[in-house]
Interface confidence: low
């Protein structure tokens, strides 16, 4: 099904307008912003999210050090182009004619330049660090039941393929999740790892994507586990290009 | 054939309260939202909210939220609307319209209100 | 609330001109923007929805165009029945919220 049916809302995204429409009176979902139609049977993409969001905003030894070509979104929110499959265009442009190129998940990954800017295909991202630090505890959580948790948390909430859930680190107070998708492991169907992290994102934050869920409650072993910050590093199967300035900043 | 007929013209004193109609057919009445759509005299469009019939889930304007209230009765394929504490800026015509996407592609004839002392 | 603004007020014409109508919204609402024509005495009648799809029954002459902020219908070749009052609509959020409105009248 594509929204729930009884009251034609879309449960994986409440950015949304619905309106039983479909055919046999289906309900039909269309993200805010954009007015694309959405499958309410899966996430939504980052792409439309943040299209909609803008119409209505360190590393211990054990732990995976993010490599020289990792991306952090330091631009925060802006209005994207979406394509029709709702993905990033490779190109974004502001309202000043200022453009740049970005990657699968919209985060960029060139220096601005102006409308003569060419992006000639959009580069995925395959590779995300989740880098989680959560407040303290009694005493540090049990790896296994953390892993299992973060990872019943992806399968189930986010419906990612555990096979794309490629490693939970721990060392207290800091968490890593990496998340691994390349372009021919992912199949027709499957979330995307961009999204899924966009998702978990927000969820983080309490700003919960999903409709009427409650927000999202991480226990492990009924333990809270309460995140006081995050940093996500993106990875990209062509290293970004920036100017010798910013990677010497 | 999609219909949406609409109950007759009413007068009403400020203060009073109107409850109108809005009677469909033609297609499977719980499965589209009812819309409702005012037009002062000589002015534009306003919404006013809309309510899913099949279980009587609605959205109001926030400018008529303390003053309408959108019912449905399934069992005629009947939406109603009623708005209280009538003022003499209410007179208008009052239109219900059904959802094709969120463009509303059927329409009722209309209902003239209107609000004197 | 999301302001919509149409412009021209009133567009005077003569049948078989091209007319242009304009709508711009307060901010980018995508695609989400309706189109309607009213004549007196009648309930609107949907043009156009999600700035460009037709709609079954509307002639080919009613197109629309744009996305973001900046709408467009086009009614190609006028014919004497299309001279009436244009209204868009935007679906993006709540409230739903119309313009202003366009009269389109015989010059």
């Known amino acids: 099904h594509t929204a729930a049916q009884d009251n034609c809302t879309c449960p994986t995204n409440k950015m949304t307008v619905c309106s039983p429409d479909g055919p046999g009176g289906r309900c039909q979902c269309r993200a805010l912003g954009s007015g694309m139609a959405v499958d309410c049977s899966t996430l939504t993409s980052k792409c439309l999210l943040l299209k909609a969001r803008m119409s209505a905003p360190k590393n211990a030894r054990t732990l995976v050090r993010p490599s020289e070509h990792a991306l952090v979104d330091n631009d925060g929110l802006y209005d994207p182009d979406c394509d029709p499959e709702g993905r990033f265009k490779a190109r974004q442009c502001n309202q000043t004619s200022v453009c740049w190129c970005v990657n699968s998940v919209g985060v960029r990954r060139t220096d601005k330049g102006d409308l003569s800017l060419r992006c000639d295909e959009l580069v995925r991202t395959h590779h995300i660090l989740i880098d989680l630090r959560h407040r303290p505890t009694a005493g540090a959580f049990n790896h296994s039941d953390l892993d299992a948790e973060l990872r019943r948390l992806f399968r189930e909430r986010y419906r990612l393929h555990p096979k794309f859930v490629a490693a939970v680190h721990y060392e207290q107070p800091t968490i890593q999740i990496e998340l691994r998708q390349n372009t021919s492991q992912k199949a027709a169907g499957d979330v995307d790892i961009g999204d899924a992290a966009y998702y978990f994102e927000r969820d983080i934050k309490g700003e919960s994507l999903f409709q009427g869920r409650g927000g999202l409650d991480l226990r492990v072993r009924g333990e809270p586990l309460q995140v006081e910050r995050t940093l996500i590093y993106y990875l990209d199967e062509i290293p970004p290009k920036f100017s010798m300035k910013r990677l010497t900043a | 054939e999609v219909q949406l007929v609409q109950s007759g013209a009413e007068v009403k004193k400020p203060g009073a309260s109107v409850k109108v109609s809005c009677k469909a057919s033609?297609?499977?009445?719980?499965?589209?939202?009812i819309n409702w759509v005012r037009q002062a005299p000589g002015q534009g469009l306003e919404w006013m909210g809309n309510?899913?019939?099949?279980?009587?889930?609605?959205n109001y304007n926030q400018k008529f939220k303390d003053r309408v209230t959108m019912t449905r009765d399934t069992s005629t394929s009947t939406v109603y609307m009623e708005l209280s504490s009538l003022r003499s800026e209410d007179t208008a015509v009052y239109y219900c319209s059904s959802y094709r996407s969120d463009g509303f592609a059927y329409w009722g004839q209309g209902t003239l209100v209107t609000v004197s002392s | 609330e999301i302001v919509l603004t149409q412009s021209p007020a009133t567009l005077s014409l003569s049948p078989g001109e091209r007319a242009t109508l304009s709508c711009r919204a307060s901010q980018n609402i995508g695609t989400s923007i309706h189109w309607y024509q009213q004549k007196p005495g009648q309930a609107p009648r949907l043009l156009i929805e999600?700035?460009?799809e037709s709609i079954s029954g509307i002639p080919a002459r009613f197109s629309g165009s744009g996305s973001g902020t900046d709408f467009t219908l086009t009614i190609s070749s006028l014919e004497p029945e299309d001279f009436a009052v244009y209204y868009c609509q935007q679906s993006n959020s709540w409230p739903f919220t119309f313009g202003g409105g366009t009269k389109v009248e015989i010059k």
């Open positions: 309510i899913y019939p099949s279980n009587s889930y609605t």
């Open positions: 033609g297609y499977t009445f719980t499965s589209y939202w």
């Open positions: 999600f700035a460009s």
